[in-house]
C-alpha cells in the first residue's frame, strides 16, 4: 500500500496523526468497527498533549476511546502498552461497577465530561474518536 501523507477530508491532523470526531453515538464495539472500516482505530492516548488535543475537540461529552479490559487486563486497541503508558482516570476509576443493572461490569473506557477517563458498560451509545497515523501504509491499493 501507499503511505498516507495527509489526512482525509473531515479528519483533523495533530502530531502526525489524523483524528475523526463523531457527532452521533454507538456502542463501543460498533465504534471500534467503524474506525477499522476507515483504516483507523479508536483513539489511543499516549501523552499529555494528545489528551489535551482530544479533550478540546470533544468538549464535555462522554466519548469512547480505544481502551478496554474485556479479556482481563486493560489493553489499547493498537497494542500500546497500558501499564507503562499515559493514564488519565478520574479518581476512584476504573471501578468495574456492577450496580448499573445492565449485567456484568464495566469494560470499556471513555472520556468523561471533564476529559478524564471512566470505565463504563460497553453497550452505551457514546460518541467516539477514530485515529490513524500518517506515514503508515494505507490499505488502499496504489493508483496506477
Amino acid at each position: 500500500g501507499s503511505e498516507r501523507t495527509c489526512c482525509p477530508v473531515n479528519w483533523v491532523e495533530h502530531e502526525r496523526s489524523c483524528y475523526w470526531f463523531s457527532r452521533s453515538g454507538k456502542a463501543w464495539a460498533d465504534a471500534d468497527n467503524y474506525c477499522r472500516l476507515e483504516d483507523a482505530h479508536l483513539v489511543v492516548v499516549t501523552s499529555w498533549e494528545e489528551q489535551k488535543f482530544v479533550q478540546h475537540h470533544i468538549g464535555p461529552v462522554n466519548t469512547w476511546m480505544g481502551l478496554h479490559d474485556q479479556n482481563g487486563p486493560w489493553k489499547w486497541v493498537d497494542g500500546t502498552d497500558y501499564e507503562t503508558g499515559f493514564k488519565n482516570w478520574r479518581p476512584e476509576q476504573p471501578d468495574d461497577w456492577y450496580g448499573h443493572g445492565l449485567g456484568g461490569g464495566e469494560d470499556c473506557a471513555h472520556f468523561t465530561d471533564d476529559g478524564r477517563w471512566n470505565d463504563d458498560v460497553c453497550q452505551r451509545p457514546y460518541r467516539w474518536v477514530c485515529e490513524t497515523e500518517l506515514d503508515k501504509a494505507s490499505q488502499e491499493p496504489p493508483l496506477l
Epitope: E49, K52, K87, N88, P91, R116
Partner: antibody
Amino acid sequence: QVYLVESGGGVVQPGRSLRLSCAASGFTFSSYGMHWVRQAPGKGLEWVAVIWYDGSNKYSADSVKGRFTISRDNSKNTLDLQMNSLRAEDTAVYYCARDNGNWNYLDYWGQGTLVTVSS
Amino acid sequence: DIQMTQSPSSLSASVGDRVTIICRASQSIISYLNWYQQKPGKAPKLLIYATSSLQSGVPSRFSGSGSGTDFTLTISSLQPEDFATYYCQQTYSPPLTFGGGTKVEIK
C-alpha cells in the same frame, strides 16, 4: 477551607540534598494532582513538577530532571519534593499547589518555603 | 518546551485605567492558558483558567481572551488592589511553563 503548608526549607550547601514536604487539609487530597512551583529571589515563577492524584503520572522541568523527585503519600495527605545535587540556582521559595483536575490550573497555593543553596 | 512571552514586562497605570497584558506562546496551546496574580511576599492567586473562565471570587473586571498562540488579560477598570505582578501559564504540554510576568505599578 483548603490549606497547604510547606516545610523543610533552609540553608544547604551545593551538592547536598533536601526534602520538602507539603501538608494538605480541607479537601480530599487523594483526588487531586499536586504541583511544585518555585520562585528565585526577585524573579518570576518557574514550574518544577506535577504528580497525578494517584501517582500514575509524574512530570518535571528539564532544569530539575534527574535531581528532583516528586512523590506523595495519600494516607498522610502529604506531598514531597526530594531535592538532590542542589545548585546555587535552585535557591528559591518553593510553593506547593493543588491541580484542579482537568485543565490543570493551580487553584490553591501554599505560603511557600525558602530554600537557600550556599557554601 | 513551549516558551511563554509576556508583554510588557512592566507598566504604569492609574486607578480606573483599562489595562491589557499580552501573553504569546511559541506554539499553539489551543486554550490551555491560565492567569495568576501575585503580590509581594505572597503566594500567587489564580484569576482566570482555560483562557477566559473566571475563577470563583475573582472580580468581573478581570477578563481573558485568545486562542492558539496569542492571549490577553484585561482589567477593565484598575483598582488599588490590582497593583501586582501577573503571570500567564500554559498547561497544554509539560513542562507547564510560565510567562516572565508583568508588573503593574501605580503611575
